[in-house]
């Protein structure tokens, strides 16, 4: 990895739990200031593998609301607008980091957690296993 | 929102910056322990809107490595294996949370940051603007 010289102005880290427990500023810096939030908002309907978005809420998690995609059809929409079952709609998934309140119900203490979310769907050629 | 009774065993939060600055345990809890990491590993090749994965590394960020998807073609692969430019391959994007070292180069102090990542690609019908 890349070794970076430590900044002398860093907060004190003499905590016995260091480096497992760190300080995190929750004032979110958004790097996407010039992006249009509606950019991909209609892909879920225009895709050949359209999806529905389901709200997943958990007050013990930060962010508390995550939207999960579920493919609308098993197959994919063809040029005629019909579902073609020779193809499969599949979810595109990503592991993301969230903060889980730990101990539970604590406002200022969290643990990093990795969860798998479905972001949208794509159309793939199915894997067909032929019997000998 | 849902009001949750505070746990009396929570860490002390008399910090003047509370609740902006919180304690986070970096021992990641993985909720996907029984998931197969190879599950969607070949979708990028089997999709009608295939994509390439590019490594984005930043030692000042946690996680330091993020994989970005870039659609391989402008159009989508048709049944004959050719690119059909009547359709568009588009990236499915998601805003995710990462930790940014702040001040820079500090091992135990971070700020939450929201970044936009492309997870994969899907095939959509293009929006055609007709001229009057």
């Amino acid at each position: 990895g890349i070794t970076i010289p430590r900044n002398p102005g860093c907060p004190n880290s003499e905590d016995k739990n260091f480096p497992r427990t760190v300080m995190v500023n929750l004032n979110i810096h958004n790097r996407n200031t010039n992006t249009n939030p509606k950019r991909s908002s209609d892909y879920y309907n225009r895709s050949t593998s359209p999806w529905n978005l389901h709200r997943n809420e958990d007050p013990e998690r930060y962010p508390s609301v995550i939207w999960e995609a579920k493919c609308r059809h098993l197959g994919c929409i063809n040029a005629d607008g019909n579902v073609d079952y020779h193809m499969n709609s599949v979810p595109i998934q990503q592991e993301i980091l969230v903060l889980r309140r730990e101990p539970p119900h604590c406002p200022n203490s969290f643990r990093l957690e990795k969860i798998l979310v479905s972001v949208g769907c794509t159309c793939v050629t199915p894997i067909v296993h032929h019997v000998a | 929102g849902i009001t949750i009774p505070r746990n009396p065993g929570c860490p002390n939060s008399e910090d003047k910056n509370f609740p902006r600055t919180v304690m986070v345990n970096l021992n990641i809890h993985n909720r996907n322990t029984n998931t197969n990491p190879k599950r969607s590993s070949d979708y990028y090749n089997r999709s009608t809107s295939p994509w390439n994965l590019h490594r984005n590394e930043d030692p000042e960020r946690y996680p330091s490595v993020i994989w970005e998807a870039k659609c391989r073609h402008l159009g989508c692969i048709n049944a004959d294996g050719n690119v059909d430019y009547h359709m568009n391959s588009v990236p499915i994007q998601q805003e995710i949370l990462v930790l940014r070292r702040e001040p820079p180069h500090c091992p135990n102090s971070f700020r939450l940051e929201k970044i936009l990542v492309s997870v994969g690609c899907t095939c959509v019908t293009p929006i055609v603007h007709h001229v009057a």
Partner: antibody, heavy 118, light 108 residues
Framework: QVTLKESGGGLIQPGGSLRLSCATS????????MSWVRQAPGKGLEWVSI???????YYADSVKGRFTISRDNSKNTLSLQMNSLRAEDTAVYYC????????????WGQGTLVTVSS | SYELTQPPSVSVSPGQTATITCSGD??????ASWYQQRPGQSPVLVMR???QRPSGIPERFSGSNSGNTATLTISGTQVMDEADYYC???????????FGPGTKLTVL
């Protein structure tokens, strides 16, 4: 009203063949996904095969190469041709209708019992 | 191959809430459906696509699905709800339908 009724079950020797039929009314077979699901005595449900509205067919690994699903659009019926039958194929066979999305089966027949035994 | 796991049996008293779970690898990314099968009868769809109740199914039946677990909840359970319950989904990886092993609900 939607109805499905299976027929063709019975006692058959191992290695033999049998053809199951599913007569339907109240809907068009060719516009829906039609499936066969079986249930061995005292056991749970096991999916066997499906023919989608576009004619695409899929089979469970346990029957692939031995069973063939088909539909007769003119008679609005579903069939399952079962060859090289084994003792483990003994079950009640249900035909079921799948809806547009394909994710679930909304109507089931009353089932027909197939017994494979010597 | 994809597998679903259900508890073999669940017991409740009349009027109580029965909760039947169905677990599978990242089941929340798929739609789960539930079927009720009374002894000697054909299966009946009681919940489709996670939380959609078909017409004719009482409001006491509800469903949810996220993470690795789908849940069928029967509030104010009645003696007539005593039956086997099967969860079902479709596996993207194999293009096959999958049923859970079933849960026997006993209303004491």
């Amino acid at each position: 009203q939607v109805t499905l009724k299976e027929s063709g079950g019975g006692l058959i020797q191992p290695g033999g063949s049998l053809r199951l039929s599913c007569a339907t009314s109240g809907f068009t077979v060719s516009s829906n996904h039609m499936s066969w699901v079986r249930q061995a005595p005292g056991k749970g449900l096991e999916w066997v095969s499906i023919i989608y509205s576009d004619g695409t067919t899929y089979y469970a690994d346990s029957v692939k190469g031995r069973f063939t699903i088909s539909r007769d659009n003119s008679k609005n019926t579903l069939s399952l041709q079962m060859n090289s039958l084994r003792a483990e194929d003994t079950a009640v066979y249900y035909c079921a209708r799948g809806r547009y999305s394909g994710w679930y089966f909304d109507y089931w027949g009353q089932g027909t019992l197939v017994t494979v035994s010597s | 191959s994809y597998e679903l796991t259900q508890p073999p049996s669940v017991s409740v008293s009349p009027g109580q809430t029965a909760t039947i779970t169905c677990s599978g690898d990242d089941l929340g990314s798929k739609y789960a459906s539930w079927y009720q099968q009374r002894p000697g009868q054909s299966p009946v769809l009681v919940m489709r696509q996670d939380d959609q109740r078909p017409s004719g199914i009482p409001e006491r039946f509800s469903g949810s699905n996220s993470g690795n677990t789908a849940t069928l909840t029967i509030s104010g359970t009645q003696v007539m709800d005593e039956a086997d319950y099967y969860c079902q989904t479709w596996d993207h990886g194999t293009s096959k339908y999958v049923f859970g092993p079933g849960t026997k609900l006993t209303v004491l």
